[in-house]
Interface confidence: medium
Amino acid sequence: AGLKLMGAPVKLTVSQGQPVKLNCSVEGMEEPDIQWVKDGAVVQNLDQLYIPVSEQHWIGFLSLKSVERSDAGRYWCQVEDGGETEISQPVWLTVEGVPFFTVEPKDLAVPPNAPFQLSCEAVGPPEPVTIVWWRGTTKIGGPAPSPSVLNVTGVTQSTMFSCEAHNLKGLASSRTATVHLQALPAAPFNITVTKLSSSNASVAWMPGADGRALLQSCTVQVTQAPGGWEVLAVVVPVPPFTCLLRDLVPATNYSLRVRCANALGPSPYADWVPFQTKGLAPASAPQNLHAIRTDSGLILEWEEVIPEAPLEGPLGPYKLSWVQDNGTQDELTVEGTRANLTGWDPQKDLIVRVCVSNAVGCGPWSQPLVVSSHDRAGQQGPPHSRTSW
């Protein structure tokens, strides 16, 4: 079969938006199945026509209503003849139009008076493409070949830049890039002490506006009174906007404040936030826990615990815990150093412990007291020890 692209030179140049019809002539076949191929892929759309000129001469048409850059490429037609695929000579379709931007100026944030660069690149066809830069509504510099880099020595306020690309088909304007001025960050806010213990405090905050420069770190300053001597200053990388303050003194009033810094410098400090560390739990266990059996039940007594350090704060009440081997157990809280125990089974062994508590919690448990079901009273000692008299 004779196969050729009709009326089409090896290179076909068309303006963007114009229609194109590619004609493929097939001779020597009665029923050719003409396929159009672009850059190696069969064209799947329905913009195709087949016309019999005579019994053995056919013309196929590929019709493009409005060509765009993506239609550019290498086209050919092909037919199957006797199990073999015959292909025509190709035609290169070039789509000409106004320049097409491959690189447009990007938004920037720069320090005042700092030098920076903006880039712009556009392509044809047709070439050459020249670039003209605009600063706001003012043209800056003459045409330069694409690609073009604009070097700016610095700006003192937010400024808009754009580039314009020219070729024989006309001009295209890029996006407008805004060059923002960087500034010091704003003070952080919503500063919260999220967790407190006797010696540690977790702090979280929200960053203020970053001044269009990446926040690099935040400083947490701690004093024992607002404006007092600095006890602690912790510099933390961010994000996250959190900090753990360690080695604080228990049961102490503190204040903290936070500031954050970008490449230009630190923000103002936020307002002081007061907080108080928790005190220490009692360090000592009640001593000399003993029991006295009475007709009405069991009286338990122990020695009063004296605070070892002022950080423990006021002590009391005492917490009493008892358990029996039948599974019965209970706790009761008493203000003094004596408790009347009821509701226990005298026929079963009883184990009793006591601790002293404060605002933080309970101190260590006393040695357990075992009251045997045979005993009339009991003494402190290791579990399961029995004392009789």
């Epitope: 329905l46 087949y50 016309i51 000129v53």
Partner: antibody, heavy 125, light 108 residues
Framework: EVQLVQSGADVKKPGASLTISCQAS????????ISWVRQKPGKGLEWMGV????????RYGPSFQGHVTISADRSTATAYLQWRSLEASDTAMYYC??????????????????WGPGTLVTVSS | SYELTQPPSVSVSPGQTARITCSGD??????AYWYQQKSGQAPVLVIY???KRPSGIPERFSGSSSGTMATLTISGAQVEDEADYYC???????????FGGGTKLTVL
Amino acid sequence: EVQLVQSGADVKKPGASLTISCQASGYTFTDYWISWVRQKPGKGLEWMGVINKYASWTRYGPSFQGHVTISADRSTATAYLQWRSLEASDTAMYYCVRSGGLTSGGTIPEYYQHWGPGTLVTVSS
Amino acid sequence: SYELTQPPSVSVSPGQTARITCSGDALPKKYAYWYQQKSGQAPVLVIYEDSKRPSGIPERFSGSSSGTMATLTISGAQVEDEADYYCYSQNPQGNYFVFGGGTKLTVL
């Protein structure tokens, strides 16, 4: 003279299968594409699909893909539209359409389309 | 799926110009075709490739396309032009056709 002769009107129950036909005469069948178009009573035209002139591939409209099958027999110059399971909503007039080009001065295409008279399909229980 | 949008109805007096529009996102790249369908008859192609007229179609029928809108114009509409008019084009990928919803032209 170009003619597209379509099969006669048909009444079917929902769930039944059906094939309607369109026989071409007056031109070489393989010169053109055959499309099928549906028109429900009192409604607009809907493009169903097309089979190319060599009966080697088909294209379907999204609403019809999987619901109908378009085929052709080159030896008898006949195109077919087939349903495996009809629904009441398939009640419509179905046109076959010859798509393609004629020669004007031998080389310049002029779009021209011949429509069959239509086949009325009624699906009712 | 792709849609072509037409006004449901257009009314003109005899001798006036009737304009029927068809909008679709792919129309900048795909040709529009126009069909006329009179009551009880099969459709007839009146415009192809946006603006071309098949032989036998009166000169008062013309077509144009701009951006996403195609327009069928009947200059000096006549009573016999009263019919339903359908635009017809391809989806953006070019792998199926679609009709517009149709416009009923009344020539009073």
